[in-house]
């Protein structure tokens, strides 16, 4: 898979492949995988990709199901890259406070908060 | 600070306190704090709270500025709790795939993706 494919296109293609191979993937009756109990997905990327690893190890590879897992590993690579960018730029307090303010603002309006 | 205050109210109050104490907080001319370079805030919670810790250690405490940092530490506690819930429930593959599909769907529509 060319890593040059834009991440947004990669995500779309992966969603389609997930639908295509759903029947094959759910065939394992006994397998249990940790599932986050809330919808703040970005907090759980580590566990999600651990789950994908578990699923991959239990799935017969070949054809486009292999492409699905390759795509998922490229998405993981992208997210790992984003995580690295969390601490790259050292800035003045003012700029950190602007970022913190936006973070709290997003938390206030977009997060699914259960008290 | 009563920990019973709903997290959503806590976030709102913290945003207000951040505005109130901004002038005091930015007074440090030389301090530099890592600022994430993208808007996917949830991926960067660790770095954001490390930055808050740096800022707290450089800020004269007392009065409501102390309350600001107490609030921020309660928000961190909430987020740490959310992170714990990422791997608590073991479920069938079907359920994991539903979550994965939702995660990719959110990534597709809501994440700020730079290729």
């Amino acid at each position: 898979i060319p890593t040059e494919i834009p991440t947004s296109a990669l995500v779309k293609e992966t969603l389609a492949l997930l639908s295509t191979h759903r029947t094959l993937l759910i065939a394992n009756e006994t397998l249990r995988i940790p599932v986050p109990v809330h919808k703040n997905h970005q907090l759980c990327t580590e566990e999600i990709f651990q789950g994908i690893g578990t699923l991959e190890s239990q799935t017969v590879q070949g054809g486009t199901v292999e492409r699905l897992f390759k795509n998922l590993s490229l998405i993981k690579k992208y997210i790992d890259g984003q995580k690295k960018k969390c601490g790259e730029e050292r800035r003045r307090v003012n700029q950190f406070l602007d970022y913190l303010q936006e973070f709290l603002g997003v938390m206030n309006t977009e997060w699914i908060i259960e008290s | 600070i009563p920990t019973e205050i709903p997290t959503s109210a806590l976030v709102k109050e913290t945003l207000a306190l951040l505005s109130t104490h901004r002038t005091l907080l930015i007074a440090n001319e030389t301090l530099r704090i890592p600022v994430p370079v993208h808007k996917n805030h949830q991926l960067c919670t660790e770095e954001i709270f490390q930055g808050i810790g740096t800022l707290e250690s450089q800020t004269v405490q007392g009065g409501t500025v102390e309350r600001l940092f107490k609030n921020l530490s309660l928000i961190k506690k909430y987020i740490d709790g959310q992170k714990k819930k990422c791997g608590e429930e073991r479920r069938r593959v079907n359920q994991f795939l539903d979550y994965l599909q939702e995660f990719l769907g959110v990534m597709n529509t809501e994440w700020i993706i730079e290729s």
């Epitope: 790259e88 730029e89 050292r90 800035r91 003045r92 307090v93 003012n94 700029q95 602007d98 970022y99 303010q101 936006e102 603002g105 | 002038t23 930015i26 007074a27 440090n28 001319e29 030389t30 530099r32 600022v35 994430p36 370079v37 993208h38 808007k39 700020i112 730079e114």
Partner: antibody
Amino acid sequence: QVQLQESGPGLVKPSQTLSLTCTVSGGSISNGGYYWSWIRQHPGKGLEWIGYIYYSGSTYYNPSLKSRVTISVDTSKNQFSLKLSSVTAADTAVYYCASLGNWFDYWGQGTLVTVSS
Amino acid sequence: SYVLTQPPSVSVAPGQTARITCGGNNIGSKNVYWYQQKPGQAPVLVVHDDSDRPSGIPERFSGSNSGNTATLTISRVEVGDEADYSCQVWDSSSAHVVFGGGTKLTVLG
């Protein structure tokens, strides 16, 4: 390599509003490490900071211009804009857009705006 | 608001040392940035955080900052150094940017 390009009319009539846009390429305007700034330079004079904006919309303006200045950001177009109202001949200058990290890293080439009837 | 004062002009012969000052109340407690601007061009950073040089800037450019004065020093001045030089700080009480008035460096000869 981040590049910035100013665009807008080179001639504005007195009392009207000066409007300029800066297009950012080679990087995202949503980069949390940068403010996006406007600076001007009157003919033969020094640099004058006008203001800057964060991708979230937080703005900071030069107190001497604050009543007339609006800076806005459009993350979907990777652009930010300057509006300066009620202009006079004293607003004739080269206007630069620039990215501001800990210092001004990247600059546009500048655009001359003349205020004249 | 915070004010930075620079001499309007400084003249120096090639090979000599030019010193351009930037005065401000207790400027030594702030980080100072210096920009070089040649006619018809955008400014270019030559010194940041008082005395650090960005990559690509010759070692001949150096800076210092203490008390009420920051200084940009250009040693072994060359004809190509002729330009306007501006100092800049952040006024951290307001998060505003402040520039000095600029100094025109003339290389004699």
